[in-house]
Interface confidence: low
């Protein structure tokens, strides 16, 4: 997260670190007691490393008593979702077993009406990504809040020229904005998950590439069909 | 002023393929999403899946995904749909369909071509 | 799927009546309904959108009104000209389904 700040500790029971061979990877969003919801470009990355989901952490680092990494039975990409496009970048990965729920650990509403947000409301967007570009990776949850970008602007040919979808969003990216990273993890719209965060690698933090984010509520139906 | 000219009536031996053509004129053909859609007396209208002229990514009605194939040739604005393993089922008129967005939300299908009507007989 | 059922297949009325098409969805769709009309030998042509929110020059006889999974399309003062079929579609999620149509035919 770029311009963004440390998280309050634990008051995104929904956030997720998806990581492979213990390292953080992408975030994640608990959407059900057994599944969390990221990005399918994750995987890509993940080659043939062990992949597992860590719930309950503020500190990627230190030991806290919500903590807990879990197993991934089954790992589920959008069957659309492609290497060479941002389209359909959605994942869906089943824990071994039903996370232990607490006041850290807990599964967040998703929209499910299939309607923009409206340009200007402003979103939460959290996680373990890069808070510089320089790389460097925060150890404690981060987050910023980002106004929603109609799709006609994010579309223009000096921004993504055409290539923003009716499934995605665009969120402001003047300075503040999600990055490496923070890819998979949850964009919050008034206490409803409304995107996650693509996985492709656009420059981060400049006004002219606004963040990309996969708009759930156009998923419903696969969402659905694999929480079945 | 938006057109969509679609390919001919095609004739088909059961078990052939077919490829439909649909070319765009009067707007930025990757600004929208290319749909196409069967028309049968007995089924209606079925929403066969789309195609993101920008990108290529396709999502597909599960019941065509087996069958169907979308493409697009961004140089010439034309997207086409190929269907294979024809049976009698698959006669019917196939349109192609711009989606349509108001205040940034897909609402349905505003533009549509003539429709091309595809027999499979033997 | 969610599926969208028009119980009428065919309705009668009379040039200057008041008419109504009936939509039901198999689950909520939020008003997420369009309605779409078909000339003999034409391509439908959208006329209505989340409801009630007529496209680009449909004329204001055609209203649509409805939430949850009941969806009507009023014609207010029916002409000639309006001799279609009548289809619905919910744009609420993917796969975009649509009503199997209601013919309304001209007395």
């Known amino acids: 997260i770029l311009g963004g700040r440390e998280a309050e500790a634990h008051a995104r029971p929904y956030m997720a670190s998806v990581q492979v061979n213990g390292e953080h990877l992408c975030g994640g969003v608990l959407v059900a007691e057994q599944w969390v919801l990221s990005a399918a470009h994750c995987l890509e990355d993940a080659a043939d490393g062990k992949v597992q989901v860590l719930l309950g952490a503020h500190s990627l680092s230190q030991p806290e008593p919500s903590k807990r990494l879990y197993d991934v039975l089954r790992a589920v990409p959008h069957p659309d979702s492609r290497p060479d496009t941002i389209d359909h970048d959605l994942l869906l990965l089943q824990l071994s077993e039903k996370a232990t729920l607490g006041p850290a650990v807990r599964p967040l509403p998703w929209q499910r009406v299939d309607r923009d947000v409206e340009p200007g409301t402003l979103c939460d967007v959290a996680g373990w990504g890069i808070v510089s570009h320089a790389g460097r990776r925060p150890d404690r949850l981060q987050h910023v809040l980002l106004p929603v970008l109609d799709r006609a602007t994010c579309n223009r040919r000096t921004h993504h020229d055409g290539a923003i979808t009716q499934r995605m969003m665009c969120a402001e990216s003047n300075r503040r904005d999600s990055c490496k990273g923070d890819s998979g993890g949850p964009l919050v719209c008034g206490g409803v998950l409304e995107g996650v965060v693509t996985s492709g690698s656009r420059v981060c933090g400049n006004r002219k590439k606004p963040g990309i984010y996969t708009r759930v509520a156009s998923y419903a139906a696969w969402i659905d069909s694999v929480l079945a | 002023e938006v057109q969509l000219q679609q390919s001919g009536p095609e004739l088909v031996k059961p078990g052939a393929s077919v490829k439909i053509s649909c070319k765009a004129s009067g707007y930025s053909f990757t600004a929208y999403y290319m749909n196409w859609v069967k028309h049968s007396p007995e089924k209606s209208l079925e929403w066969i899946g789309d195609i993101n002229p920008s990108t290529g990514g396709t999502t597909y009605n599960q019941k065509f995904k087996a069958r169907a194939t979308l493409t697009v040739d961004k140089s010439s604005s034309t997207a086409y749909m190929q269907l294979k393993s024809l049976t009698s089922e698959d006669s019917a008129v196939y349109y192609c369909?711009?989606?349509?967005?108001?205040?940034?939300?897909?609402?349905?299908?505003?533009?549509w071509g003539q429709g091309t009507l595809v027999t499979v007989s033997a | 799927d969610i599926v969208m059922t028009q119980s009428h297949k065919f309705m009668s009325t009379s040039v200057g009546d008041r008419v109504s098409i009936t939509c039901k969805a198999s689950?909520?769709?939020?008003?997420?309904v369009a309605w779409y009309q078909q000339k003999p030998g034409q391509s439908p042509k959208l006329l209505i959108f989340w409801t009630s929110t007529r496209h680009t020059g449909v004329p204001d006889r055609f209203t649509g009104s409805g939430s949850g999974t009941d969806y009507t399309l009023t014609i207010s003062s029916v002409q000639a000209e309006d001799l279609a079929l009548y289809y619905c579609q919910q744009h609420y999620t993917t796969p975009w389904t649509f009503g199997g149509g209601t013919k309304l035919e001209i007395k």
């Open positions: 369909a711009t989606t349509y967005y108001s205040g940034n939300s897909y609402v349905g299908f505003a533009y």
């Open positions: 689950q909520d769709v939020s008003t997420a």
